[in-house]
């Protein structure tokens, strides 16, 4: 049996076109071999009419083509201007005509019946515009023009050239009479409703000599496109409603009971609370198309979504719409990760971000979701060594633990860091995840001096006090830079006296810088980890100055507040800068986020995935 498949019977009428799709197993050999369409002769041969190698029979010249789609394992034969002579038995196949890798197709072309009652069929999508053309003869050029709709047995006047408009069509219909040269008038109906479908009659003149033309208007409700996405993953709805609604407010809504469609997000600034922190409506293109990204998908997000355009920013009768049926797969490939991470003012958080482990070489990013306007997510850090200026010294993206997870550490927390953050890569866009950072009451667990000044050529010792709760953790010091935090040698100096009610298991671990140079200036972190999993960190800025008096410096906690020094942050840190990423393709499939990094100087980023899974800031 041949592995080629296609339609066994194709029926059409004279003058029409057909598109015959033939399916083949998309092996490497099949993808590249010759494709053909041939007509079977009475004696069993098969005469090639068209092939993928450029041959076209004179019978098909100018009216047929063959297109191969190797990625789908299909090729399509289009034949136009059919005549009854085209009726017959054909084969679509691969390789050589006589070799059997083919499929038999019967094509039957009947005589065209012409349109019954001279009826013109108009098939138009819901919310769009139809133009019904009505020809007339010269003798009726000066007479009344009208359009009727057949309701049951009776024609009901819809519009006429004397100015009448049926109330059901007010504000969305017009009658145009072409210039004197053309014997034609047109009726244009906008914002088509399902109820507009039916039989129409246009008429020029009112007596027995009037010209009449029948029209059948079919209004199509869009079939939902089926979308299957993983729990905790991400979905993008691409909405292209056409340039005629480019300047009309756009919306995405989710159908609830009956005909209700609850707005999820719109361009007028509305956003459903359930989507706070995990939705972006990307700016629309000139042609009116836009896209909506939802991350942190939940079971309850499944359902029917409509995007549309209406001045109210919500679904109304006559809105042009597109539809999707979203299914959320609970057997998700995206691992569970905390959706809420808690930290204290002055403390830190370590956020675990999942990514598709097949894409270990992809660039990783972390951005802060902002709800203003339609939502956006300016980048804060990436895995290629870029960190947003306001976050220098307190934010790091680490490739560890790897194998499908990376880590983001943010310290020197303030209440302004509370919000929703997104983890993403320039690879699989379905793996965007969200996490909410909450700032709670409490003191940081690690105690370090606030700021430290070292003297050129001298030795500096910086203490970090670890409470006993971290006794089983690895303790480290490192020097922060844009690409991470490079580990430094440190000394365990025994139990710390910085904690009340903490036994011998508390620890004082010092960083020692010998013969300080200008290169030693910068941010230093002390922290705890277990293997490749990071816990709390604390940051100290070390300034370097000229020698004033001899000796080494030993910094104690008493010399500085336990809270981190915040002067590195701009006073304008909270303002949303206008350079945040606004490229609509940023969160679409086509464009790597990296391309827009230089635009990413907006504020910080955030994300909600709304479940109750929570992670404290101090440990995993």
């Amino acid at each position: 049996k041949s592995p080629i498949f296609g339609p066994e019977e194709v029926n059409s009428v004279e003058g029409n076109s057909v598109s015959i799709t033939c399916y083949y197993p998309p092996t490497s050999v099949n993808r590249h071999t010759r494709k053909y369409w041939c007509r079977q002769g009475a004696r069993g041969g098969c005469i090639t009419l068209i092939s993928s190698e450029g041959y076209v029979s004179s019978k098909y010249a100018g009216r047929a083509n063959l297109t191969n789609f190797p990625e789908n394992g299909t090729f399509v034969v289009n034949i136009a201007q059919l005549s009854q002579d085209d009726s017959g038995r054909y084969k679509c196949g691969l390789g050589i005509n006589s070799r059997g890798l083919s499929f038999d197709v019967s094509l039957e072309v009947s005589q065209g019946p012409g349109l019954l009652n001279d009826t013109k069929v108009y098939t138009v999508d819901l919310g769009r515009t139809v133009t019904i053309n009505c020809p007339f003869k010269t003798e009726n050029a000066q007479k009344r023009k009208s359009l009727y709709k057949q309701i049951g047995l009776y024609p009901v006047l819809v519009i006429d050239s004397s100015g009448y408009v049926n109330p059901n069509y007010t504000g969305r219909i017009r009658l145009d009479i072409q210039g004197t040269g053309q014997l034609l008038f047109s009726v244009v109906i906008n914002q088509l409703r399902l109820s507009d479908a039916g039989q129409y009659l246009c008429q020029a003149g009112d007596d027995s000599n009037s010209n009449k033309k029948n029209a059948d208007l079919q209004v199509l409700k869009p079939e939902p496109e089926l979308v299957y996405e993983d729990l905790r993953g991400s979905v993008t709805f691409h909405c292209a409603l056409g340039p005629e609604v480019a300047n009309v407010a756009k919306f995405l809504c989710r159908q609830s009971s009956g005909e209700n469609c609850d707005v999820v997000v719109n361009t007028l600034g509305k956003r459903a609370p359930a989507f706070e922190g995990r939705i972006l409506l990307n700016p629309q293109d000139k042609d009116g198309s836009f896209s909506v990204v939802i991350t942190g998908l939940r079971k309850e997000d499944a359902g029917r979504y409509l995007c549309g355009a209406h001045s109210d920013g919500q679904l109304q009768e006559g809105s042009p719409i597109q539809a999707w049926q979203l299914f959320v797969n609970e057997e998700s490939t995206i691992p569970r990760s905390p959706t809420v991470v808690k930290g204290v003012a002055g403390g830190s958080v370590a956020v675990l971000c999942p990514y598709n482990r097949k894409e270990s070489k992809s660039i990783k990013y972390w951005c802060l979701w902002e709800g203003a306007q339609n939502g956006r997510c300016p980048l804060l850090v990436d895995s290629e060594g870029w960190v947003k200026a306001q976050y220098e010294g307190r934010l790091s993206l680490l490739e560890e633990p790897g194998n499908g997870t990376f880590t983001v550490i943010l310290n020197q927390l303030t209440s302004r860091d509370a919000g929703f953050y997104w983890c993403l890569t320039n690879g699989d866009t379905l793996w965007r995840t969200t996490v909410e950072i909450k700032i709670i009451e409490g003191e940081p667990n690690l105690k370090v001096p606030g700021n430290v000044t070292a003297v050129l050529g001298e030795t500096l010792k910086v203490p970090c006090h670890f409470p006993c709760k971290f006794s089983s953790y690895e303790k480290y010091w490192c020097k922060w830079n844009n690409t991470g935090c490079q580990a430094l040698p440190s000394q365990d100096e025994g139990p710390s006296k910085a904690f009340v009610n903490c036994d011998e298991n508390s620890r004082l671990v010092s960083l020692t810088l010998n013969l300080v140079t200008r290169a030693d200036e910068g941010w230093y972190w002390c922290g705890v980890k277990q293997g490749h999993f990071y816990g709390e960190t604390a940051a100290v800025y070390v300034a370097v100055e000229e020698r004033k008096a001899a000796g080494s410096r030993d910094v104690s906690l008493a010399k500085a507040d336990a809270a981190p020094d915040e002067k590195v942050l701009d006073s304008g840190f909270r303002e949303i800068e206008n350079k945040a990423i606004q490229d609509p393709r940023l969160f679409a499939e086509e464009k790597a986020v990296a391309d827009t990094r230089d635009q990413a100087d907006g504020s910080r980023a955030s994300v909600d995935s709304g479940s109750s899974e929570e992670q404290g800031g101090s440990s995993r």
């Epitope: 498949f5 339609p7 029926n11 059409s12 076109s17 009947s110 098939t123 409700k221 079939e223 049926q325």
Partner: nanobody, 131 residues
Amino acid sequence: EVQLVESGGGLVQAGGSLRLSCAASGSGRTFTSYTMGWFRQAPGKEREFVSALTWADDSTYYKYYADSMKGRLTISRDNAKNTVYLQMNSLKPEDTAVYYCVATGRGLTYDPRDRRKYDYWGQGTQVTVSS
């Protein structure tokens, strides 16, 4: 929402014939804008493609049949009644299965044998062929 209701199943002797019907309702679109077809599922087996009928417009349509039943099937439809029919001849015991009517509004852009591409499924009608 499109509803599909199958009928015409039953018990038949090997070599006999059956005509299955599937009535569609509930759509704002014209019936010819849908691809309609049939799948079947025998006990303990996967659902498999039987036949499909796709309309490109009011006068152009394409009929597809499964290799396993080639020459024994005829699919047709009555657009006025919004009904699709499957005439099955020379039935064999291995044709015993639940036959499902399917529909999709996707048009011609996919392999009609791919069951994932059908948005609407009927409840199914049992066909039993005794030897």
